[in-house]
Interface confidence: low
């Protein structure tokens, strides 16, 4: 996911002027003008602001990476929500990439949880019922599981 800073680059494209700031702040979906006299609307599908602010520019909408699907498109008040494609998940330790879910469990283990966009499959030992956490032998060609985080706006 491409993540923008709070200081997006200047853009020359005209934006529609809307209203005067309230106590120097502009409402969601707007940013403040250089002279702090006007609230300027963000451009739908291009940039956004989520709450009352004094940003000189709206925040640029996230573009979902290949390997991700767009769950919610960007509006003037909400960033794009991206989610890993089916069969892949986003790991907490490396949220910038979608990793392939394991296709099956190691020998002697059973699957108790399916692959979701925010977590790998979960395997437990047949007898003990304890979760599998250790490295899987290379021959299995699998990736160890780890707790994931739910899909969220990429801001």
């Amino acid at each position: 996911i491409t993540r923008q800073s709070l200081d997006p680059q200047r853009r020359a494209a005209p934006q529609q002027k809307r209203s005067s700031p309230t106590e120097g702040l502009c409402p969601p979906g707007h940013h403040i003008s250089e002279d702090s006299r006007e609230c300027i609307s963000c451009k739908y599908g291009q940039d956004y602001s989520t709450h009352w602010n004094d940003f000189l520019f709206c925040l640029r909408c996230t573009k979902c990476d290949s390997g991700e699907v767009e769950v919610n498109s960007c509006t003037t008040t909400r960033n794009t929500v991206c989610q890993c494609e089916e069969g892949t998940f986003r790991e907490e330790d490396s949220p910038e990439i979608c990793r392939k879910c394991r296709t099956g469990c190691p020998r002697g283990m059973v699957k108790v949880k399916d692959c979701t966009p925010w977590s790998d499959i979960e395997c437990v030992h047949k007898e003990s019922g304890t979760k599998h956490t250790g490295e899987v032998p290379a021959v299995e060609k699998t990736v160890t599981t780890s707790p994931g985080t739910p899909a969220s706006p990429c801001s």
Epitope: E23, G24, L25, T50, H51, W52, N53
Partner: antibody
């Protein structure tokens, strides 16, 4: 769900130092202004300090200016208050509060449960 | 003299309407300020109730019922918090705050203790 959890309070001698922390979760911390507000036992609310979303602008009440420092670490979703040269009159519950905007307005929409600081010899 | 003055205590019966007052010192003009109100129940942190600038420019806090409403009297330099259909859980301390963007430091009123009589 927005959550603010303060820590670091305790008993300290006059002239001593203490560092309060506020762990924020449930919102995009790096785009909101933040405040510290205190309340002495049985007294009203006293605004202590505020910091804008980026940490570039910091403001203090006259009563703490030069002794307290507000700071934030947006990567850690944390707000801090470094308190030096503490006096008995700094004894209070210290609340961390979120501003509803990037700046510092009077609109403090979410508050933590507070942490007690006692300055006594 | 404090910038914001609130009466220390007020009381009213269950089910009635009460209006709490916050008076701004007269070297300031309430016309350019928003009035903010906070509620603090015993043993709890403060809770934001509402902001009032004008009838067309006001905002209610999260999960704050419409029984709580704000108003202003520019001639008297006062802000008001009205609470209708008073309930036992409305018994609390109420603080006002005022400000404009140009003034970043924050001042609270001294607070009014509201007692709900059964």
């Amino acid at each position: 769900e927005v959550q603010l959890v303060e820590s670091g309070g305790g008993l300290v001698k006059p002239g001593g130092s203490l560092r309060l922390s506020c762990a924020a979760s449930g919102f995009t911390f790096s785009t909101y202004g933040m405040h510290w507000v205190r309340q002495a036992p049985g007294k009203g609310l006293e605004w202590v300090a505020g910091i804008n979303y980026s940490g570039n602008n910091k403001y203090y009440a006259d009563s703490v200016k030069g002794r307290f420092t507000i700071s934030r670490d947006n990567a850690k979703n944390s707000l801090y208050l470094q308190m030096n040269s503490l006096r008995a009159e700094d004894t209070a519950v210290y609340y961390c509060a979120r501003d509803h905007s990037t700046w510092l307005s009077r609109h403090l929409d979410y508050w933590g449960q507070g942490t007690l600081v006692t300055v006594s010899s | 003299q404090p910038v914001l003055h609130q009466p220390p205590a007020m009381s009213s019966a269950l089910g009635t309407t009460i209006r709490l007052t916050c008076t701004l010192r007269n070297d300031h003009d309430i016309g350019v300020y928003s009035v903010y109100w906070y509620q603090q129940r015993p043993g709890h942190p403060p809770r934001f109730l509402l902001r009032y600038f004008s009838q067309s420019d006001k905002s209610q806090g999260p999960q704050v019922p419409p029984r709580f409403s704000g108003s202003k009297d520019v001639a008297r330099n006062r802000g008001y918090l009205s609470i209708s259909e008073l309930q036992p859980e409305d018994e609390a301390m109420y603080y006002c705050a005022m400000g404009a963007r140009s003034s970043v430091t924050h001042v609270f009123g001294s607070g009014t203790q509201l007692t709900v009589l059964s």
